[in-house]
């Protein structure tokens, strides 16, 4: 009987630790996408609607803030698209990029953790163009550090929640 009680306590402890594991999945806020063709920071993301969820992390001022030290898997998926119904591209040669950046407040510094993308030729003769970037990686993050997303050509972002998103989840503690 004691062994059974110990086992269930162990399960409970495991489960509560699992439930406390920080994670976030943030989706683009389509109503507030900046315009421009240069690199801009995307600050408007959903954290609590549709596929978007957050737990034991904080979303503030366009940045995902780490609340617990640990090793995290970070990921970002960015889709760019253009359909001729919205007009013509002013240039057919495009650099479509995403940058995942870590900012530390304690020691003011900023580092690009991941980048991805390509230069593209989107011919004016085509009705529709689409390009997707996915980046992911494993990083040691400290409490208070902030993760943000920058992209080029934000006016070409696909605003759907299944197209443009980023997130993180803690994989293990720092020993």
């Amino acid at each position: 009987e004691k062994a059974m009680v110990d086992g269930s306590w162990l399960d409970l402890a495991k489960r509560s630790k699992l439930e406390a594991q920080p994670f976030a999945h943030l989706t683009i806020n389509a109503t507030d996408i900046p315009s421009g063709s240069h690199k801009v920071s995307l600050s408007s993301w959903y954290h609590d609607r549709g596929w978007a969820k957050i737990s034991n992390m904080t979303f503030s001022n366009g940045k995902l803030i780490v609340n617990q030290d640990g090793f995290y898997y970070l990921y970002a998926n960015i889709c760019f698209r253009h359909h001729e119904t919205s007009g013509d591209l002013a240039t057919e040669y495009l650099q479509l990029m995403v940058y995942v950046t870590k900012t530390s407040i304690k020691i003011p510094s900023s580092h690009t953790l991941m980048k991805g993308g390509s230069t593209k030729y989107w011919s004016g003769n085509s009705e529709f163009h689409f390009y997707s970037i996915n980046v992911g990686g494993f990083f040691k993050l400290r409490s208070g550090e902030e993760i943000s997303i920058e992209v080029s050509n934000p006016s070409l972002l696909d605003p759907d929640q299944d197209a443009t998103y980023f997130g993180a989840f803690k994989v293990r503690d720092i020993d």
Epitope: G36, H82, E84, T85, G87, D88, L89, A90, T91, S155
Partner: antibody, heavy 126, light 103 residues
């Protein structure tokens, strides 16, 4: 205030060419595209082409491809539209119009024509 | 190629009347639809862009609605200075125009 001032009326014989100018003022010429639109007597408005005043990129209607050239002089804040091999059905009022999209802010030619020139009547007659 | 069709081609109304012009696209164009006013010998004027946004300086009696393939321009109270031809436009395609006259 934003103004587009076009050159005066022209009369040409069939087979000849015409070049219409469009001088912009009141805004940074290089930051916007200029479109050319015409209206023949009793006809609907007809889009001809655009030029991105910043980089000189152009796009033309298939109908005018090979007959039209659009250029710009950024120092003079002026766009030019030349139409060659004129025929009687090219008799129309030719307009230049500014695209509303600022190219510093975005890369889409939006086809919202927020300011127009006063029009240039081109008559093609033998 | 998208074709824009306007109706009616002309209309006659009294000052103060509510006037409605319809524009149909041959396929869905989302909300990428603009309305212009043309008066003889004058530069055309953008009234409505993006189906329903009023261009700066345009009187509030003008309004636009619709999305997909069907759009409407409404003049809530026709004024003598509104006598003109009105055109809908999506990118490279214009409607054939609606001539508005006073009764």
């Amino acid at each position: 205030q934003v103004q587009l001032v076009q050159s005066g009326a022209e009369v040409r014989k069939p087979g000849a060419s015409v070049k219409v100018s469009c001088k912009a003022s009141g805004y940074d010429f290089s930051n916007y595209a200029i479109h050319w639109v015409r209206q023949a007597p009793g006809q609907r408005l007809e889009w001809m082409g655009w030029i991105n005043a910043g980089n000189g990129n152009t796009k033309f209607s298939q109908k005018f491809q090979g007959r039209i050239t659009v250029t710009r002089d950024t120092a003079a804040s002026t766009a030019y539209m030349e139409l060659r091999s004129l025929r009687s059905e090219d008799t129309a009022v030719y307009y230049c119009a500014r695209d509303s999209e600022n190219m510093v802010r975005g890369i889409i030619i939006a086809y919202y024509f927020d300011y127009w020139g006063q029009g240039t009547l081109v008559t093609v007659s033998s | 190629e998208i074709v824009m069709t306007q109706s009616p081609s002309s209309l006659s109304a009294s000052v103060g009347d509510r006037v409605t012009i319809t524009c149909r696209a041959s396929q869905s164009i989302s909300r990428y639809l603009n309305w212009y006013q043309l008066k003889p010998g004058k530069a055309p004027r953008l009234l409505i862009y993006g189906a329903s946004s009023l261009q700066s300086g345009v009187p509030s009696r003008f309004s636009g609605s619709g999305s997909g393939a069907e759009f409407t321009l409404t003049i809530s109270s026709l004024q003598p200075e509104d006598i003109a031809t009105y055109y809908c436009q999506h990118t490279r395609a214009f409607g054939q125009g609606t001539k508005v006259e006073i009764k």
